[in-house]
C-alpha cells in the first residue's frame, strides 16, 4: 500500500528506479481506497516526465518505459488522478508523487581544467607543491563510492608524486634543469576508491622547470691567444674570450675581469648584449721593451643569490698570451726641441750644436737629417749644425728652424724637432743719435743758454743697462761757440758758450760729438750736430725757426 | 709522450744555404708556438727563432734575421728552418724547441742536430 | 736586448752540498718572466724553473727558483750525482736570451 495513512489528501511515499536500465522497471502501484476492485475506478498520469513512466489504468502499477540518467533528471515529479468511469468524475482530488532516479556507476571521472601546465624552480627540495588537479564525477556523491575518487600517477616517477586524496603533486627527486626543462606527468582518478567495477580518466600535466642559478660559467678555452700591435691607442679593443653559463636568461649574465696583470697593461670589459669578454689595452704597448703578456682572467655571475653561492666557489679563470706586433716606428729625438746658442759675427762654417735622433726598433737605422728654416744653416749626417752665413743679431736674434729625420733604410719613417737658435750679441755697433736733431740758436742768444739735449742709442743688446759717454770732439776747434756737457744719465746737453750769434755772417755751426758706449772692448762713433742760427726776434724763441727755415729754403723772406 | 727530432744538419760552405726540420709527435702539433735556439761549440744557448701556433707571427734574432726564415707544416707535424747565407759563426748545433702552453719557457727540446759551416 | 750575467762561471762543489747560482739582468724583467735550465754534456737543456718560481713537471722539490726584478737565484738544497751540470738562466719578458751559463762540477 503506497498511500499514506492521512486520508484528507494523497501524499505518496517516494518511489525509486534504477537508472540506465534498458528492461521496463515496474516502481509500484497507486490505489486509491475508494477502489472495491470492481474496475470502475481509472489511474491517470499527469506532469512533466510523465511520458517516461506509464500507468496501468486499472491496477495503478507504474512502470518506467524507457532508460533514464540520473545525471540529466535525477527526480520525477509525477500528478496522480482517480476516475471513477462510472460517472465520469474525478473521485479524490490530483495528487503529486515523486519517482527518485537512483544512481549507478556510470560516469568516469573528469579533469574540467584542462589543460595543467605547472612551473617549478630546478632543484627543489623533495615534498615541494607543484599543482593541483580535481576530477568531476558526475555521479551521485552521496550514493556509496560511485563518485569517490582516487589519485594515482601513471608516468612522472620517480620525479613526481600524488596525494590519492587531493590530486596534489608534489617533487619526490630533485631536478636539473640543464639536464630535462620539461616534463609531462599523467594522473588517474579512479571512483568507486579503486575498487573492482571502477571507472578512470587521466589528465596530462606539463611541467616546467624553471632556472636557478646553480652554474657558474666556465671559460670555452684554457688557453687565448691574442696579437696587439704596438701602434695601437690606449682604449683599443684587441680581442675577445668567452665563457659559457649552463643557465639561462639572468642567471647566465656575467662580468668578466682581470685576476692577474702585473704589467697593468691591459683590462677586461663585459659585453652584457654577447657575453664576451673584450680585452682592452690600458697602456700603450712597446715591442722594443717587452714583446709579449700574459694576463690571467676571471669569469662570475652577475646575480648570485647567498643561498646559492656553493655553486659559485671557485671562479672560472683563462690564461690570456698577448703577442705584441712590431711596427716601423719613425726615428725618436732625444729632445722634444733644442735650444742652440751663436756668437754673432762668427765666420761660415761654424757649429752651431747637434741634434740626436735614434731608430727605437731593434735594428737601429742610421738617420739622414734635413733642415729647413733658414739658409743661413746647414746639417750633416751626424746632426750636426753649421752656419753658411755670418750671423748678424740685429739683423735677427733667432732663428726657428725643423730639422727632419728620415730612417736610411726606410726613408718613409720621418721625424722632426724645432730647433731654436739664439744669436748672442758681441758688440759689434757704435752708438748714435737716438734721432735726426735740428737745432737751432737764435741770434740774441745768451751765454750758457741750453741749445739741445741729445741722446744716443745702440744697437747692440746690452746685459746690463747701456751707458754712453759723450764728448765733444777734439778736431772740432772751430765750434768754441758751443760746449757740451754729459749729464751721465746717456743724455747730454748743448750750450751756448757765448752771447750773440750773427745769422748773415755764420748762419750754421757744425758740432762733432763723439759718443762711446760702455762695452768691452769699448765703441764710439763720431755725430755731427748741425746748429743753425736763426732770428728770433726778442722773444728769443726758437719754435718759428723750422718754419722760418722752410720759407728760406722756398725762396721767402721773413721780416 | 712528447717527442722532437731534428734532422737536416751537415757541413755546408759558406754562402749556402741548408734546410732543417724537426719531428713533433705525441701532442697537439699545432696548438703550441715553436722555437730553434742554437748552441756553437763549446759557447752557451742562443735563441734563433719562434713561430706562432698558427705560423701566422714569426719573430727571428737580430742574427740571423734576413737570412733564416721559420716555417710549420701542421698536416706534418713538423718545423722547418731555411738557412741561407750561411756563415761560419753559424755552426752551432741546432735545437727545437716548445714553447709551455701557459708560459714562453721551453718544455721539450730535441736532441739537436749539427750545422758546421766552413770552406 | 736584456742580457742575462750568471755567476758563479763554475762552482765546485761535493754531493750532498746546497748550490746556489746566481743571474742578473740588465733591465727588470716584467712578470718574473725567468726560467732556469740545465744542460748534461751531450744532451739537450732540461727545463727546471719557469715564471722564477715555479718547479717544471718532474722536476724534484730539492730544485727551487727565487727572485724578482734584475736579480734571480736557483737553489739545489742537496747536490746528486745527476745534478753535475751547465745550468742556464733564461729571459721571456722580452724576447728571449739565455745567461751564459753556470758550471756545476763535482769538487
Known amino acids: 500500500d503506497y498511500k499514506d495513512d492521512d486520508d484528507k489528501a494523497w501524499v505518496w511515499r517516494p518511489f525509486v528506479v534504477l537508472e540506465e536500465m534498458d528492461d521496463i522497471q515496474c516502481v509500484g502501484k497507486l490505489r486509491s481506497d475508494l477502489d472495491n476492485g470492481n474496475n470502475s475506478f481509472q489511474y491517470k498520469l499527469l506532469g512533466i516526465g510523465a511520458g517516461s513512466f506509464s500507468i496501468n489504468e486499472r491496477t495503478g502499477e507504474i512502470c518506467a518505459i524507457q532508460k533514464l540518467d540520473r545525471e540529466e533528471k535525477s527526480l520525477y515529479i509525477l500528478r496522480a488522478q482517480v476516475i471513477d468511469t462510472t460517472i465520469g468524475k474525478a473521485v479524490e482530488t490530483e495528487s503529486e508523487f515523486v519517482i527518485r532516479v537512483l544512481d549507478i556507476n556510470d560516469n568516469e571521472p573528469k579533469f574540467l581544467d584542462e589543460p595543467y601546465e605547472a612551473i617549478v624552480p630546478e632543484m627543489s627540495p623533495e615534498g615541494t607543491l607543484v599543482i593541483q588537479v580535481t576530477a568531476s564525477d558526475a555521479d551521485d556523491p552521496s550514493s556509496g563510492n560511485n563518485a569517490r575518487l582516487l589519485y594515482s600517477l601513471l608516468q612522472g616517477q620517480p620525479y613526481f608524486s600524488v596525494e590519492p586524496t587531493t590530486g596534489v603533486i608534489r617533487i619526490s627527486s630533485k631536478m636539473d634543469r640543464e639536464l630535462q626543462d620539461e616534463y609531462w606527468v599523467i594522473i588517474q582518478a579512479k571512483d568507486m576508491i579503486g575498487q573492482p567495477g571502477a571507472l578512470s580518466g587521466t589528465t596530462s600535466v606539463l611541467i616546467k622547470l624553471s632556472d636557478v642559478n646553480d652554474n657558474k660559467p666556465i671559460f670555452k678555452e684554457s688557453l687565448y691567444r691574442l696579437t696587439v700591435s704596438e701602434s695601437a691607442p690606449t682604449g683599443t679593443s684587441i680581442g675577445t674570450i668567452m665563457a659559457y653559463d649552463n643557465d639561462i636568461g639572468e642567471n647566465a649574465e656575467m662580468d668578466y675581469s682581470i685576476e692577474e696583470d702585473d704589467s697593468q697593461t691591459f683590462d677586461i670589459i663585459t659585453n652584457h648584449e654577447t657575453q664576451e669578454g673584450i680585452v682592452i689595452l690600458k697602456k700603450k704597448v712597446d715591442f722594443e721593451h717587452q714583446n709579449h703578456y700574459g694576463i690571467r682572467a676571471k669569469v662570475k655571475n652577475h646575480h648570485v643569490p647567498e643561498q646559492l653561492m656553493k655553486y659559485h666557489t671557485e671562479a672560472s679563470t683563462t690564461f690570456i698570451k698577448i703577442q705584441v706586433e712590431d711596427v716601423d716606428e719613425p726615428p725618436v729625438f732625444l729632445l722634444p726641441y733644442y735650444i742652440l746658442e751663436i756668437p754673432e759675427g762668427k765666420p761660415y762654417g761654424t757649429i752651431v750644436g747637434t741634434v740626436s735622433a735614434t731608430d727605437p726598433d731593434r735594428r737601429q737605422s742610421p738617420m739622414r737629417y734635413y733642415l729647413t728654416g733658414s739658409k743661413m744653416f746647414d746639417i750633416n749626417d751626424n746632426g750636426t749644425i753649421i752656419t753658411t752665413n755670418m750671423l748678424d743679431r740685429e739683423v735677427s736674434a733667432w732663428y726657428n728652424l725643423t730639422v727632419t729625420a728620415t730612417e736610411t733604410y726606410n726613408v718613409q719613417q720621418i721625424s722632426s724637432a724645432h730647433v731654436y737658435v739664439q744669436v748672442f750679441n758681441i758688440n759689434d755697433n757704435a752708438p748714435e743719435f737716438s734721432q735726426f736733431y735740428e737745432t737751432y740758436v737764435c741770434e740774441n742768444a745768451e751765454s750758457g743758454e741750453i741749445v739741445q739735449i741729445i741722446s744716443a742709442i745702440d744697437r747692440d743688446e746690452s746685459i746690463e743697462d747701456h751707458h754712453f759717454y759723450f764728448n765733444h770732439s777734439l778736431e772740432d776747434t772751430n765750434n768754441s761757440s758751443f760746449m757740451l756737457t754729459d749729464n751721465q744719465d746717456n743724455t747730454a746737453v748743448i750750450l751756448s758758450n757765448r752771447t750773440g750769434f750773427n745769422l748773415k755772417e755764420e748762419p750754421v755751426f757744425y758740432m762733432i760729438i763723439l759718443i762711446a758706449d760702455n762695452g768691452i772692448p769699448s765703441l764710439t762713433s763720431t755725430n755731427t750736430l748741425t746748429i743753425q742760427v736763426c732770428d728770433c726776434g726778442d722773444s728769443r724763441n726758437t719754435e718759428t725757426c723750422a718754419n722760418k727755415g722752410l720759407l728760406f729754403i722756398m725762396g721767402f723772406r721773413t721780416e | 709522450q712528447v717527442q722532437l727530432v731534428e734532422s737536416g744538419g751537415g757541413v755546408v760552405q759558406p754562402g749556402r744555404s741548408l734546410r732543417l726540420s724537426c719531428a713533433a709527435s705525441?701532442?697537439?702539433?699545432?696548438?703550441?708556438?715553436m722555437h730553434w735556439v742554437r748552441q756553437a761549440p763549446g759557447k752557451g744557448l742562443e735563441w734563433v727563432a719562434v713561430?706562432?701556433?698558427?705560423?701566422?707571427?714569426?719573430y727571428y734574432a737580430d742574427s740571423v734575421k734576413g737570412r733564416f726564415t721559420i716555417s710549420r707544416d701542421t698536416s706534418k707535424n713538423t718545423l722547418y728552418l731555411q738557412m741561407n747565407s750561411l756563415r761560419a759563426e753559424d755552426t752551432a748545433v741546432y735545437y727545437c724547441?716548445?714553447?709551455?702552453?701557459?708560459?714562453?719557457?721551453?718544455?721539450?727540446w730535441g736532441q739537436g742536430t749539427l750545422v758546421s759551416v766552413s770552406s | 736586448e736584456i742580457v742575462l750575467t750568471q755567476s758563479p762561471g763554475t762552482l765546485s762543489l761535493s754531493p750532498g752540498e746546497r748550490a746556489t747560482l746566481s743571474c742578473r739582468a740588465s733591465?727588470?724583467?716584467?712578470?718574473?718572466?725567468l726560467a732556469w735550465y740545465h744542460q748534461r754534456p751531450g744532451q739537450a737543456p732540461r727545463l727546471l724553473i719557469y715564471?722564477?718560481?715555479s718547479r717544471a713537471t718532474g722536476i724534484p722539490d730539492r730544485f727551487s727558483g727565487s727572485g724578482s726584478g734584475t736579480d734571480f737565484a736557483l737553489t739545489i738544497s742537496s747536490l746528486e750525482p745527476e745534478d753535475f751540470a751547465v745550468y742556464y738562466c733564461?729571459?721571456?719578458?722580452?724576447?728571449?736570451?739565455f745567461g751564459q751559463g753556470t758550471k756545476v762540477e763535482i769538487k
Open positions: 715564471g722564477a718560481s
Open positions: 705525441g701532442f697537439t702539433f699545432s696548438s703550441y708556438d
Open positions: 733591465q727588470s724583467v716584467s712578470n718574473t718572466y
Open positions: 713561430i706562432s701556433y698558427d705560423g701566422t707571427n714569426e
Open positions: 733564461q729571459q721571456y719578458s722580452n724576447s728571449w736570451t
Open positions: 724547441a716548445r714553447e709551455r702552453y701557459f708560459d714562453w719557457s721551453f718544455d721539450y
